[in-house]
């Protein structure tokens, strides 16, 4: 038994036929010693007397509000809730499995940007006697603060004969660092109470994995002279992180009729305009995705082909800070070839995802995982890799990126990747290895020496362990190169001579 909140206790029960249940001792919160009686809920039947009451809790009939009285006066209450465990698994009766992106997904979370603000939601078919409370933190062993509001009913839907209720909550990391590479996941814990049943649900994620930008805004069409082509332009959504030279998006532009199976024109671009072929009765739609990390696409923003008007795709209020001014040259060191670094780091992003595309959708976090991923270098908050830090002195950040590149280059050349099951030399991992080396050489010219980090002894003995470790390394490499690519894109746009 444990205390959920003041005067509310959760009894954990193994739930099977003829289970013995749990013996619970309740103590009346009073200085009085005698003449105390106990009742349950609205019943006037006296269950026992004395300052303590011992009960055997086996089923929901044994749960409820226990009250101690003296001479018709209420002294204190203790509410007992039950948390059922069947075959070693805690019950999940209150919330509905959303089955996306995988089975047993009860909580789903999304973030519109890297500000540390995110929204989680869940579904239930229960309409009454239902309460939720939400807690969150960054990391679990040494948790950093995340503040969550109250869960509210956000939507009601009819699904066949049933009504389905969607609840949501907004949370904000207390000390968010949008430009840093996350090393510890956000943990979200939802306590759900229905009548006398208690359940808890958890989700663990990195903000980068739950990013879903708002749709592009202000779609505009401009027909091209003597052509079937139309130039479509748009803007970044207001809610996306700034500056956009650092937090860049990529876009998919599509022209399609009302029916899903109709023919279409489709083009991908990193720019905020594209030329497409418009057809009568068709619409032009644009959606956005983080340019360097394969998280979710936004919803579509659309405008009909017939009108050459504009559409407000995005909504909501702005990201964090602006900044398009030119930055001064790098103090305290020679400037890298920003544009070359940008191209190579973007190639690294592509390779990191093609080396293991599914890794983004696999849940590789398990016990002890915080330790495993902390063995690799991360671009942290104080490393100067944010736009302001790059403006002040990019050398700190470049040194950190260089250390990481060397580290991962050595890891990809180690027994973890060269051992069984074997990879061929020109596999995406082989190309990734070569590109890491190429970028590190671009960053550190001859005669320039930065200290490098020691490689920890991660080498596992079993092939399956090696495979799991590869996944984890590639996973964190994807995050590392995304930050590096943002740094070089921003540098190329604002720091290049």
């Amino acid at each position: 038994i444990w205390e959920l909140k003041k005067d509310v206790y959760v009894v954990e029960l193994d739930w099977y036929p003829d289970a013995p249940g749990e013996m619970v001792v309740l103590t009346c919160d009073t200085p009085e010693e005698d003449g105390i009686t106990w009742t349950l809920d609205q019943s006037s039947e006296v269950l026992g007397s004395g300052k303590t009451l011992t009960i055997q809790v086996k089923e929901f009939g044994d749960a409820g509000q226990y009250t101690c009285h003296k001479g018709g006066e209420v002294l204190s209450h203790s509410l007992l809730l039950l948390h059922k465990k069947e075959d070693g698994i805690w019950s999940t009766d209150i919330l509905k499995d959303q089955k996306e992106p995988k089975n047993k997904t009860f909580l789903r979370c999304e973030a519109k940007n890297y500000s540390g603000r995110f929204t989680c939601w869940w579904l239930t078919t229960i309409s009454t006697d239902l309460t939720f409370s939400v807690k969150s933190s960054r990391g679990s062993s040494d948790p950093q603060g995340v503040t969550c509001g109250a869960a509210t009913l956000s939507a009601e839907r009819v699904r066949g004969d049933n009504k389905e209720y969607e609840y949501s909550v907004e949370c904000q990391e207390d000390s968010a660092c949008p430009a840093a590479e996350e090393s510890l996941p956000i943990e979200v814990m939802v306590d759900a109470v229905h009548k006398l049943k208690y359940e808890n649900y958890t989700s663990s994620f990195f903000i980068r994995d739950i990013i879903k930008p708002d749709p592009p805004k202000n779609l505009q069409l401009k027909p091209l002279k003597n052509s079937r082509q139309v130039e479509v332009s748009w803007e970044y959504p207001d809610t996306w992180s700034t500056p956009h030279s650092y937090f860049s998006l990529t876009f998919c532009v599509q022209v399609q009729g009302k029916a899903k199976r109709e023919k279409k024109d489709r083009v991908f671009t990193d720019k905020t305009s594209a030329t497409v072929i418009c057809r009568k009765n068709a619409s032009i739609s644009v959606r956005a995705q983080d340019r360097y990390y394969s998280s979710s696409w936004s919803e579509w923003a659309s405008v009909p082909c017939s009108g050459s008007g504009s559409s407000r795709g995005g909504s909501g209020s702005g990201g964090s800070g602006g900044g398009g001014s030119k930055l001064r040259a790098v103090p305290g060191g020679s400037s890298p070839a920003w544009t070359q670094c940008q191209q190579l780091s973007q190639k690294l992003c592509t390779l990191a995802w093609s080396a293991h595309p599914l890794v983004g959708h696999m849940d590789l976090r398990e016990e002890g995982d915080e330790e495993t991923t902390n063995d690799v270098p991360h671009i942290q908050c104080g490393d100067g890799c944010d736009p302001q830090g790059l403006r002040d002195n990019s050398q700190f950040c470049l040194q950190r990126i260089h250390q990481g590149l060397i580290f991962y280059e050595k890891l990809l050349g180690s027994d973890i990747f060269t051992g069984e099951p074997s990879l061929l030399p020109d596999s995406p991992v082989g190309q990734l290895h070569a590109s890491l080396l190429g970028l590190s050489q671009l960053l550190q010219p001859e005669g320039h020496h930065w200290e490098t980090q020691q490689i920890p002894s991660l080498s596992p003995s079993q092939p399956w362990q090696r495979l799991l470790l590869r996944f984890k390394i590639l996973r964190s490499l994807q995050a590392f190169v995304a930050v590096a690519a943002r740094v070089f894109a921003h540098g190329a746009a604002t720091l290049s001579p």
Epitope: R228, Q229, T250, R261, E262, K263, K264, D265, R266, V267, F268, T269, D270, T275, I277, R279, K280, S354, P357
Partner: antibody
């Protein structure tokens, strides 16, 4: 399944015109874009243009503008490509292809060899 | 127009080996890049679209990667039926253009 059957080989004199046909089956003719791509002997592929059978819209590669005309006959599910003022370097296999997506080529015809020789 | 350059022009590989074909665009084309295979006397067939998307019915040994200006088609373990000419094609802007092709021949 989606199928494109092209007309037979042609031999033409320089300055003449050629009209190659492409009969579609296995799908609703107006649901796919139709492209024409050619390949000179031992050479690579060269895109000529596309037509939307639904409305007759066309887009031609600048190289062929003014010399090529693409048309369709929806009653027979047939597309046509006419190339005028033929030169010897127009000797090639001409392919029609169809796709629901405008910018790449999914289903190909078997090709029609057009020889331009005096 | 966008110029597509493929390398090498000819690639000699033994059956069972891996083949890596390159395609470079004269300007950034995002992921608007498609790969085709052509055998002698046959029409080309689509292998990969939008740089890395696989086509149903195409063996899993064919994979694509890249974005921007540099792209790669990888055949993980060459089978006898894979010896052919491979073309890349950009769809970033009209006119649509192809690379000159890479001939994969038996070593």
């Amino acid at each position: 399944q989606v199928q494109l059957v092209q007309s037979g080989a042609e031999v033409k004199k320089p300055g003449a015109s050629v009209k190659v046909s492409c009969k579609a089956s296995g799908y609703t003719f107006t649901d796919y874009y139709l492209h024409w791509v050619r390949q000179a002997p031992g050479q690579g592929l060269e895109w000529m243009g596309w037509i939307d059978p639904e409305n007759g819209d066309t887009e031609y590669a600048p190289k062929f503008q003014g010399r090529v005309t693409m048309t369709t006959d929806t009653s027979t599910s047939t597309a046509y490509m006419e190339l005028r003022s033929l030169r010897s370097d127009d000797t090639a296999v001409y392919y029609c292809n169809a796709n629901k997506e405008l910018r790449y080529f999914d289903v190909w015809g078997q090709g029609t060899m057009v020889t331009v020789s005096s | 127009e966008i110029v597509m350059t493929q390398s090498p022009a000819t690639l000699s590989v033994s059956p069972g080996e891996r083949a890596t074909l390159s395609c470079r665009a004269s300007q950034s084309i995002s992921i608007n890049l498609h790969w085709y295979q052509q055998k002698p006397g046959q029409a080309p067939r689509l292998l990969i679209y939008f740089a890395s998307q696989s086509i149903s019915g195409i063996p899993a040994r064919f994979s694509g990667s890249g974005s921007g200006t540099e792209f790669t088609l990888t055949i993980s373990s060459l089978q006898s039926e894979d010896f052919a000419v491979y073309y890349c094609q950009q769809s970033n802007s009209f006119p649509l253009t192809f690379g000159g092709g890479t001939k994969v021949e038996i070593k």
